[in-house]
């Protein structure tokens, strides 16, 4: 099959996923495209354990994740259900703040300096994290 069995060079393996941590900044859409060209996606945080892992690697730096509400409701880029899933917003967030003067509100989620999440203007050039799952194909249930 075409599934990955080990992580690419410069990626970090954790709990059957591979993570890549940028050291430069891009707008959210550009970061999303970067991950997709690497056959990955912006990181989708599904547990407190994964949150702590990512937080440990990024440090106290604003960093994009794969969560946005550009089309209305909040959505994870891989289709993980937002409403029932893990969340770690800062108090009073997300607030879709319009006071930044850049036009529009805030539609993209990022890790803040303490790891908790905030929504912000998608054009801001923040660092980002790509994620791809190992053995994607082999984890699917067998056909009956």
């Amino acid at each position: 099959g075409s599934e990955r069995t080990c992580c690419p060079v410069n990626w970090v393996e954790h709990e059957r996923s591979c993570y890549w941590f940028s050291r430069s900044g891009k707008a959210w859409a550009d970061a999303d495209n970067y991950c997709r060209l690497e056959d990955a996606h912006l990181v989708v945080v599904t547990s407190w354990e994964e949150q702590k892992f990512v937080q440990h690697h990024i440090g106290p730096v604003n960093t994009w994740m794969g969560l946005h509400d550009q089309n209305g409701p909040w959505k994870w880029v891989d289709g993980t259900d937002y409403e029932t899933g893990f969340k770690n917003w800062r108090p009073e967030q997300p607030d879709d703040w319009y006071g930044h003067g850049l036009g529009g509100g805030e539609d993209c989620a990022h890790f803040t300096d303490d790891g908790r999440w905030n929504d912000d203007v998608c054009q801001r050039p923040y660092r980002w994290v790509c994620e791809t799952e190992l053995d994607k194909a082999s984890q699917e249930p067998p056909l009956l």
Epitope: S2, P8, V9, N10, W20, S22, R23, S24, K26, A27, A29, D30, N33, R36, L37, E38, D39, P125
Partner: antibody, heavy 121, light 107 residues
């Protein structure tokens, strides 16, 4: 030795179709994103399209969106560019290129010699 | 789309000369910039990536620099084989875009 060899170019009438191929050798093809770049006569380089290693994600220049499809067959180590509804302004030398990986950026580190597409009636 | 404005469009120089080519991005692209050399009938060649990193096998007389949205390619001592056309390219955002090119000619 890492090599890319384009083929499939030729003379085609406006509105016609053409499929370009790029045969890769000397590296693990499926591990690398690939791209097409063109150069019209007397003009500069223009990025056309890119595709991820698995072929699952594709990207296009506005000038070709809807008329061009990039694809790859990793079992054959071959990259393709299907070009439809061709126009005179698509006349160019078409290069395929491999995207190298270094830390967090890939330049187009290996290029083919190019194949010429001429759109004319 | 991000515009890459390259200058000069051509430069006449002699062997041994120092040649500098400039590329200006229409918006911030961090260091997501590469430089290529193109000769007629030959495959293009990557010289510099991430604005200042020298591609393996490229002579050290080639160097790249970044200052905000301005990028430079410098050939410290021009050699006969360096007469060619040079292009910058940004990979910060799709669509990736190239500069218009700079032709380095023999004086």
């Amino acid at each position: 030795e890492v090599q890319l060899l384009e083929s499939g170019g030729g003379l085609v009438q406006p509105g016609g179709s053409l499929r370009l191929s790029c045969a890769a050798s000397g590296f693990t093809f499926s591990n690398y994103a690939m791209t097409w770049v063109r150069q019209a006569p007397g003009k500069g380089l223009e990025w056309v399209s890119a595709i991820s290693g698995s072929g699952g994600n594709t990207f296009y220049a506005d000038s070709v969106t809807g008329r061009v499809t990039i694809s790859r067959d990793n079992s054959k180590n071959t990259l393709y560019l299907q070009m439809n509804s061709l126009r005179a302004e698509d006349t160019a030398v078409y290069y395929c290129a491999k995207l190298g990986k270094d830390y967090h950026y890939y330049g187009m580190d290996v290029w083919g010699q190019g194949t010429t597409v001429t759109v004319s009636s | 789309d991000i515009q890459m404005t390259q200058s000069p469009s051509s430069v006449s120089a002699s062997v041994g000369d120092r040649v500098t080519i400039t590329c200006r991005a229409s918006q911030v692209i961090s260091n997501w910039l590469a430089w290529y050399q193109l000769k007629p009938g030959k495959a293009p060649k990557l010289l510099i990536y991430t604005a200042s990193s020298l591609q393996s096998g490229v002579p050290s007389r080639f160097s790249g620099n970044e200052s905000g949205t301005d990028f430079t390619l410098t050939i410290s001592s021009l050699q006969p084989e360096d007469f060619a056309t040079y292009y910058c390219q940004q990979a910060n955002s799709f669509p990736w875009t190239f500069g218009q090119g700079t032709k380095v000619e023999i004086k």
